[in-house]
């Protein structure tokens, strides 16, 4: 806390300008009126205040707005945002996307801080859902944002927002998250033609069920191995050799290099060796000829 001291004669600030950078902390406290600061917040970012001076300015705003800052002030916080705690931010009601963008810009290039996470949480909760414009903004600043959400949180993403998602935004998503996002993407892109649809849906396929993979295998999509390796193992296992061959097209040769890795390894174990041999890739580990394959999971389901 800065002690309350009288402002020296002639030092009372009439406006927020560069002359204030020469004020000591106690002078800023004594000579800058909080209401003046609030109305001229847009000037603060244009003045090279030190961290210590920003502390004083924050203190003044806190005294003026003990219940939380109005959005007109929040939008112009600039570097002062770095001084805010999550507790401060929880008092705010941020509704404008422009305000959100302005504050994210301050933290640009740095890891998502607890302050930023709190800000985003407040903003999204205030909007009720993660709409396209918000998602666009968040993934522009934090490409991994989508994958930081829980499956429950992702369930509030409307299918229309999926258009804003870029492949790199899904890089760190796990299967549980893709399970939620895939049906939304399927819905969002449903009116696209075959090849365009595949380009858009490709990054979401880690959440695709077997029947959708079977359908894709009929469309000459030529899925690359990187995408195939990210598919759900349980979705890949029921695919026949012919279906995988059609799904991968010319990329089928890549199976050999991946034969020891999931899901390829587990898929090989489920195929007849005869069928694998038709690929001419030298894949080994299939079911030998003459063996009967019992699908016990089907038997359990029937009983």
């Amino acid at each position: 806390e800065v002690e309350k001291t009288a402002c020296p004669s002639g030092k009372k600030a009439r406006e927020i300008d560069e002359s204030l950078i020469f004020y000591k902390k106690w002078e800023l406290e004594a000579c800058v009126d909080a209401a003046l600061l609030a109305t001229q917040m847009d000037r603060v970012n244009a003045i090279p205040f030190t961290y210590e001076q920003l502390d004083v300015l924050k203190h003044k705003l806190d005294e003026l707005y003990p219940q939380g800052y109005p959005e007109s002030v929040i939008q112009h916080l600039g570097y002062l945002f770095l001084k805010m705690s999550p507790e401060d931010i929880r008092k705010w009601n941020v509704t404008s996307l422009e305000t959100l963008k302005a504050l994210l810009e301050v933290n640009k290039g740095h890891e998502m801080s607890p302050q930023v996470a709190t800000l985003i949480d407040r903003f999204v909760k205030g909007r009720g859902q993660l709409d396209k414009d918000t998602l666009d903004t968040l993934t522009a600043f934090y490409p991994g944002y989508l994958c930081s959400l829980s499956p429950e949180e992702l369930s509030s993403v409307p299918p229309s927002s999926i258009w804003a998602v870029r492949p790199q935004d899904l890089d760190t998503c796990d299967p549980r998250q893709l399970d939620v996002l895939y049906p939304k993407a399927r819905l969002a892109f449903q009116n696209m033609n075959g090849s365009e649809y595949f380009v858009k849906i490709q990054s979401f396929l880690g959440g695709a069920p077997t029947e959708d993979l079977k359908a894709l295998s009929q469309q000459n999509v030529s899925m690359d191995l990187a995408t195939f390796m990210k598919l759900r193992t349980d979705a890949v296992l029921p695919l026949t050799v012919a279906e995988v061959q059609k799904l991968l097209g010319p990329h089928v040769e890549g199976l050999k290099a991946e034969e020891r890795h999931r899901p390829v390894r587990d898929w090989i174990l489920r195929q007849r060796q005869d069928d694998l041999d038709t690929l001419g890739l030298g894949l080994q580990g299939g079911i030998p000829n003459g063996y009967l394959v019992l699908d016990l999971s089907m038997q359990e389901a029937l009983s």
Partner: nanobody, 122 residues
């Protein structure tokens, strides 16, 4: 790792000009305000100029105002200090530094270059 590399220093006659450059990594450059400081022998490090990442605002120390110009090239991730009408008292090691905020205080700058010597002879 953050790296700031200055260049362009040298020996120049009073009244002459020099242009200092400071190359930064793309990440540092896009997420930081950049400043120039100088330190003469036996003296404290002194603020020279800064350029604000947000809004591009610029601030100069009174001692260099009207003579020095700070600028940046986003495509090259480089900040410059164009120095003209140089005086013997401008002799110092010039440092480039980056900060998360737009500040005139050396304490607020996290990363520093190795410095480049500027000598102005009379």
């Amino acid at each position: 790792e953050v790296q700031l590399v200055e260049s362009g220093g040298g020996l120049v006659q009073a009244g002459g000009a020099l242009r200092l450059s400071c190359a930064a990594s793309e990440r540092t450059f896009s997420s930081s305000s950049m400043g120039w400081f100088r330190q003469a022998p036996g003296k404290e490090r002194e603020f020279v100029a800064a350029i604000n990442r947000i809004g591009g605002h610029i601030y100069y120390a009174d001692s260099v105002k009207g003579r020095f110009t700070i600028s940046k090239d986003n495509a090259k991730n480089t900040v410059y200090l164009q120095m003209s009408s140089l005086k013997p008292e401008d002799t110092a090691v010039y440092y480039c530094a980056s900060s998360r905020i737009y500040s005139h205080s050396a304490r607020d700058y996290d990363y520093w270059g190795q410095g480049t010597q500027v000598t102005v002879s009379s």
